[in-house]
């Protein structure tokens, strides 16, 4: 749980955050796990600790290993582990899988590629972007803050994109690169006002007290990939996260399905151990895109117990 994988290239800067989070005022000590030797905090060292961050300026292959961070409050010490691997620079253009960050998908309407890990660094715009090692040039490519936007995305825009930026530490500059794959969904699509497929508006669902129940909010937004298309549940007009009821959880992530070419999104509200007070709540399925917001309301009612009357002759 409190171990995190990090990687980088030799002669580049690498900054790693302690996986164990604490209040910002807490002291963080870093150690080489194998030797238990403390990592210095003085910035004149090539590898040094700076609060929650461990900095390799620049990194060397020999830095690879497990690092221990101990977050210290006035009364508690809590431990995390950073598993760091530094690789030699590749002689050719090929970026091996082990250096790749998570793949992102895009379409004509949504082509943002975020530069991974950049938030950890002290950098200034603009970012440099490369595709398959070639510098990106032309008006179709816009480096905006920490991401790249591609206009009029086409299928041959798929590939490996590398962001390159300069980390500045006390006036010294260090190069950082990070690569991720970009895939393109090839659909000519359109967007329209959301249509909620489920639940029906003002629907009532029968439930049994003490049982679990699921409510599905499903809406379609047009055809093909959508720039903005979200569905969510609200309880009495409040976000689920603001409701502070651990029994009622909205499914993490949203399932995107394409039925008959339509872009439809579902999210499930899971209610564990249904209580009487759940019957008093208003459950709103909200579907939102650039065209607007549509809302369908569903309420829960107690399932009538089946009569089990015996007939005596």
């Amino acid at each position: 749980k409190f171990s995190k994988q990090s990687w980088g290239l030799e002669n580049e800067a690498l900054i790693v955050r302690c996986p164990r989070q604490g209040k910002s005022s807490y002291i963080v000590d870093w150690y080489y796990s194998q030797t238990n030797k403390s990592i210095p905090t003085q910035e004149r060292n090539r590898v040094f600790a700076s609060g929650q961050l461990l900095k390799f300026l620049p990194a060397e292959v020999a830095d690879s290993g497990i690092y221990t961070c101990i977050v210290r409050s006035p009364t508690f010490n809590r431990t995390g582990y950073a598993n760091v691997t530094i690789y030699k620079k590749q002689p050719d253009c090929n970026v091996p899988d082990y250096l790749m960050y998570s793949t992102v998908s895009g379409s004509e309407k949504n082509s943002k590629i975020y530069c991974p890990t950049i938030d950890l660094y002290n950098w200034t715009a603009p970012l440099e972007w490369f595709k398959n090692c070639q510098a990106l040039q032309g008006s179709r490519y816009k480096a905006h803050k920490s991401f790249l936007v591609i206009d009029n995305v086409m299928t041959d825009d798929a590939g490996d994109y590398t962001c390159k930026f300069i980390h500045n530490e006390n006036g010294a500059n260090y190069s950082v690169t990070a690569t991720r794959s970009f895939t393109v969904k090839d659909e000519q699509g359109f967007s329209r006002f959301p249509v909620i497929r489920a639940p029906a508006h003002n629907e009532t669902k029968e439930v049994e007290i003490g049982e679990n129940t699921n409510l599905t909010c499903s809406a379609c937004f047009g055809k093909g990939a959508q720039f903005l298309a979200t569905v969510q549940w609200q309880l009495n007009g409040n976000k689920i996260t603001d409701f502070s009821e651990p029994r009622i959880q909205q499914e993490e992530g949203q399932n995107q399905s394409f039925s008959n070419g339509l872009a439809c999104v579902n999210t499930v509200l899971r209610i564990a151990d249904v209580k009487e007070e759940d019957l008093l709540l208003r459950y709103d399925c909200l579907a939102l895109n650039l065209h607007g917001l549509r809302r369908h309301t569903i309420r829960l009612s107690r399932k009538n117990p089946i009569d089990h009357q015996s007939t005596y002759c």
């Epitope: 989070q21 409050s73 502070s244």
Partner: antibody, heavy 123, light 107 residues
């Protein structure tokens, strides 16, 4: 020295109300999450409610939701528990306690506890 | 909610003996588990956090182990002041839950 001192307990009839207070000293009250835990006579510990530090988000056990309200006044270093519609099963010693670590979305242990205040719900 | 089951309910031992208390979670709590000691008429006192770390001022005879769903509190050699009720508590998710307690009594 960290100190938590509960007050406001007593005998109340079913359906009645009580407001418990917990006066904190010896630490920067506003940055810590605070918790109420209760213990029925001869029974185990039961978490009742939590409140975040400056953010103020609140959490409740199912058994008290809709009847109890946790709040805090950081300017007075005081935690409160407003208890309405009291039932016989709410009879317990109520402790306030401090969560010394929790960050948004997480919880931790209770490192300091008050001495408790007894709430008796009976007709 | 996560249910914590402690065993045994009561442990009858003599001073100087080793006490082994168990706490089992209904689902994984990683290492987000604590142990408390409570004496009659007193508030609980934190002994162990993150499954195995001793809280400040807790004697070395108290140790915690385990992760996931099975946890153990061990008192290596019981002192007279150790006879009390011990509770485990998980804090991986709300609602925070406690075990029902294990009473360590003098044999």
């Amino acid at each position: 020295e960290v100190q938590l001192l509960e007050s406001g307990g007593g005998l109340v009839q079913p359906g009645g109300s009580l407001r418990l207070s917990c006066a904190a000293s010896g630490f920067t009250f506003s940055i810590y999450d605070m918790i109420w835990v209760r213990q029925a006579p001869g029974k185990g510990l039961e978490w009742v409610s939590s409140i975040r530090g400056e953010g103020g988000g609140t959490y409740y056990a199912d058994s008290v939701k809709g009847r109890f309200t946790i709040s805090r006044d950081n300017s007075k270093n005081t935690l409160y528990l407003q208890m309405n519609s009291l039932r016989a099963e709410d009879t317990a010693v109520y402790y306030c306690a401090r969560d010394p670590w929790s960050t948004e979305g997480s919880f931790f242990v209770l490192d300091y506890w008050g001495q408790g205040t007894l709430v008796t719900v009976s007709s | 909610e996560i249910v914590l089951t402690q065993s045994p309910a009561t442990l009858s031992l003599s001073p100087g003996e080793r006490a082994t208390l168990s706490c089992r979670a209904s689902q994984s709590v990683d290492d987000d588990l604590a142990w408390y000691q409570q004496k009659p008429g007193q508030a609980p006192r934190l002994l162990i956090y993150d499954a195995s770390n001793r809280a400040t001022g807790i004697p070395a005879r108290f140790s915690g182990s385990g992760s996931g769903t099975d946890f153990t509190l061990t008192i290596s050699s019981l002192e007279p002041e150790d006879f009390a009720v011990y509770y485990c508590q998980q804090y991986i998710t709300a609602p925070l839950t406690f075990g029902q307690g294990t009473k360590v009594e003098i044999k």
